[in-house]
Amino acid sequence: GCINITSSASQEGTRLNLICTVWHKKEEAEGFVVFLCKDRSGDCSPETSLKQLRLKRDPGIDGVGEISSQLMFTISQVTPLHSGTYQCCARSQKSGIRLQGHFFSILFTETGNYTVTGLKQRQHLEFSHNEGTLS
């Protein structure tokens, strides 16, 4: 089978949502965990992650081949402490398969704004006053 992991971000006012999306076949879900790490280039694991999510054992309906599961990590107010390098990963506790998404970064500027970089599938958006830039 083919399991795919992507990273994205969305903004709601001062909130920043970091999203890990895993696409998988329903029979591949069991034992899979998706997790988000910060500043962990080598040892990103569920245990060292900011948040983790077990993939659905059941998509809820039977007439689907591939389904998506989303982990969402919400930062209510971005501060300098949130600056760093993030990565979405997934691991099967059953088969040992390990997936690593590309790295993306949050850069907090001296002016009190922030930029999210490395999310290639997102369009460039400009924000001011503690509302950052997604690029």
Epitope: D58, G60, I61, D62, G63, Q70
Partner: antibody, heavy 121, light 107 residues
Framework: QVQLVQSGAEVKKPGASVKVSCKAS????????MQWIRQAPGQGLEWIGA????????QFTQKFRGRATLTADKSTSTAYMELSSLRSEDTAVYYC??????????????WGQGTTLTVSS | EIVLTQSPATLSLSPGERATLSCRAS??????LHWYQQKPGQAPRLLIK???QSISGIPARFSGSGSGTDFTLTISSLEPEDFAVYFC?????????FGGGTKVEIK
């Protein structure tokens, strides 16, 4: 053994909201979709929506989208269905039901006892 | 939305007779169909899963068949406790839907 226990009967006025609870026990709450179904007096079964407590994914039928809110409290293994802007046509028995694991059961294998909602001025 | 149409709306039979209930889907749903029995004042009870698969604790006189768009629930020999309302339900796609029901009543 698996059990779904719902909150008691409610009487509401038109325009009000109601929140029905469904406490689950005897299984891993976060691994199964919880369904919400209603049945008006003398009528058939009408599916409202479902929530997956593992990640809070919720699905609704178009009729209830925006008016029904489904939530799940993992710490107490309790699912909730809130229905707003109530009208007399919402008078019904509301059921929660668990969907069995796909390809194994698939249907709604355990049901709550039902919560009667009466909307009347 | 997949519409499930059950027929007949009412079936009048005597104990010991064979009951044949139909459920037709507005589009193909493979075998993703389930049958329920409901008695007055009670919650529905799952009878048959995935069109034809039996459920533990359900008497063998209940059987299901069909695939695609046409499905049948058969009660081989009606017992007094089988007089109730029967619903079909599809799990093929969102939104999940129920048929309108068939009432099996004593003739």
């Amino acid at each position: 053994q698996v059990q779904l226990v719902q909150s008691g009967a409610e009487v509401k006025k038109p325009g009000a909201s109601v929140k029905v609870s469904c406490k689950a026990s005897g299984y891993t709450f976060t691994d199964y979709w919880m369904q919400w179904i209603r049945q008006a007096p003398g009528q058939g079964l009408e599916w409202i929506g479902a929530i997956y407590p593992g990640d809070d994914d919720a699905q609704f039928t178009q009729k209830f989208r925006g008016r029904a809110t489904l939530t799940a409290d993992k710490s107490t293994s309790t699912a909730y269905m809130e229905l707003s802007s109530l009208r007399s046509e919402d008078t019904a028995v509301y059921y929660c039901a668990r969907r069995g694991i796909a390809a194994v059961v698939g249907g709604f294998d355990y049901w709550g006892q039902g919560t009667t909602l009466t909307v009347s001025s | 939305e997949i519409v499930l149409t059950q027929s007949p709306a009412t079936l009048s039979l005597s104990p010991g007779e064979r009951a044949t209930l139909s459920c037709r889907a507005s589009q193909s749903i493979s075998n993703h169909l389930h049958w329920y029995q409901q008695k007055p004042g009670q919650a529905p009870r799952l009878l048959i899963k995935y069109a034809s698969q039996s459920i533990s604790g359900i008497p063998a006189r209940f059987s299901g068949s069909g695939s695609g768009t046409d499905f049948t629930l058969t009660i081989s020999s009606l017992e007094p406790e089988d007089f109730a309302v029967y619903f079909c339900q599809q799990s093929n796609s969102w939104p999940l839907t129920f048929g309108g029901g068939t009432k099996v009543e004593i003739k």
